[in-house]
């Protein structure tokens, strides 16, 4: 089952006993499967397995990527998984830990060229569930090494949103990924109704900015399901 496959998952942020933001869980930590944290006058424990569901890599942490944890069961459930270290197998850049990228199915260091010239890389994107198959459309492109030490401006090639400057996200453009602006109020956005449908977009949009959510435009409520227009709107 999904639970048993992932019980070794990294311990996620821990809950404070009485709500509010979780800071440090306290110094006392129990052995697995529980974590001790202060709860009133006594310590309570929390199961250390906290799967974090996602649809895009950007929803996960910088040290994680979004994928289906098992090839067979629990189809459609994608969660944040720990990134893969150097020399581990990969299918796309986001699977590799920061400072690495995916080349020929292996995570390699992005500084191995000492930032000279350009890094040639293969971007493998598959349509549908690009997490569970090695099949896909491959296209060779060049990736400026500058992106690894300066935040990418709009139009810069990127691997993940953390490569882009503030107000930009890393989104698919043809078979590459570039920095695009985070969407503003009133701009058209994409609502993923079908699991994994973001894998079909070759011109991917960023997500809506702070305080906005992607909702059906008021005057489009009567339109047919397929032609509904979604825009970024205030909560």
């Amino acid at each position: 089952t999904l639970n048993s496959v992932l019980n070794s998952n990294a311990i996620k942020n821990l809950p404070p006993p009485l709500g509010g933001a979780a800071g440090h869980p306290g110094s006392a930590v129990s052995a697995a499967p529980g974590i001790l944290y202060p709860g009133g006058n006594k310590y309570q424990t929390i199961d250390n397995y906290q799967p974090y569901p996602c649809a895009e890599d950007e929803e996960c942490g910088t040290d994680e990527y979004c994928a289906s944890p098992t090839r067979g069961g629990d189809a459609g459930v994608q969660i944040c998984l720990a990134c893969r270290k150097r020399r581990k197998r990969c299918m796309r850049h986001a699977m590799c830990c920061p400072g690495n990228y995916c080349k020929n199915g292996i995570c390699v260091s992005s500084d191995q060229n000492h930032f000279r010239g350009e890094i040639e890389e293969t971007i493998t994107e598959s349509f549908g569930n690009d997490h569970s198959t090695l099949d896909g459309y491959s296209r060779r492109t060049t990736l400026s090494s500058k992106m690894y030490h300066t935040k990418g401006q709009e139009g810069s090639v990127c691997l993940r949103s953390s490569d882009c400057a503030s107000g930009l996200c890393c989104a698919r453009h043809f078979w590459s990924k570039i920095c695009k602006p985070v969407l503003k109020e009133g701009q058209v956005c994409t609502k993923h109704r079908r699991k994994g449908s973001h894998g079909l977009e070759i011109f991917q949009r960023c997500y809506c900015g702070e305080g906005l959510s992607c909702r059906i435009q008021k005057d489009h409520h009567q339109a047919s399901n397929s032609s509904r227009l979604h825009t970024c709107q205030r909560h």
């Epitope: 929803e59 993923h192 699991k195 305080g211």
Partner: nanobody, 125 residues
């Protein structure tokens, strides 16, 4: 100040249904994943269900699959847990949790950083 307020808990007979709600208020951040956890007396707090930012990826614990349904309404900053075919072993305090992030913020590891106080669910047999 950020607050998560759960409601909808109570006493129900085995086989019955309850719908829990959790409203997030205060704070100017984007709500990413939202989840429900529970803790029975003398046991560890465990995850029940969680839903991704877009709602397209949903996780359920094996023990509640086919009986519980999680959903979210971003306009209302609310997450719901519809619980059907309740069993005595579902008796616990249910907590909602969310991942709230400032614009452009991305932690090293995604997790639930805001938690509610909990609502008691008691299933009598």
């Amino acid at each position: 100040e950020v607050q998560l307020v759960e409601s909808g808990g109570g006493l129900v007979q085995a086989g019955g249904s309850l719908r829990l709600s959790c409203v997030v208020s205060g704070g100017t951040f984007n709500v990413y994943a939202m989840g429900w956890f529970r803790q029975a007396p003398g046991k560890l707090r465990e995850i029940v269900a969680a839903i991704s930012r877009t709602g397209s990826s949903i996780y359920y614990a094996d023990s509640v699959k086919g009986r519980f349904t999680i959903s979210r309404d971003d306009a209302k900053k609310t997450v719901y847990l519809q619980m059907n075919s309740l069993k005595s072993e579902d008796t616990a305090v249910y907590y909602c949790a969310v991942d709230g992030r400032a614009n452009g913020e991305r932690p090293a590891v995604a997790g639930y950083n805001y938690w509610g106080q909990g609502t008691q669910v008691t299933v009598s047999s």
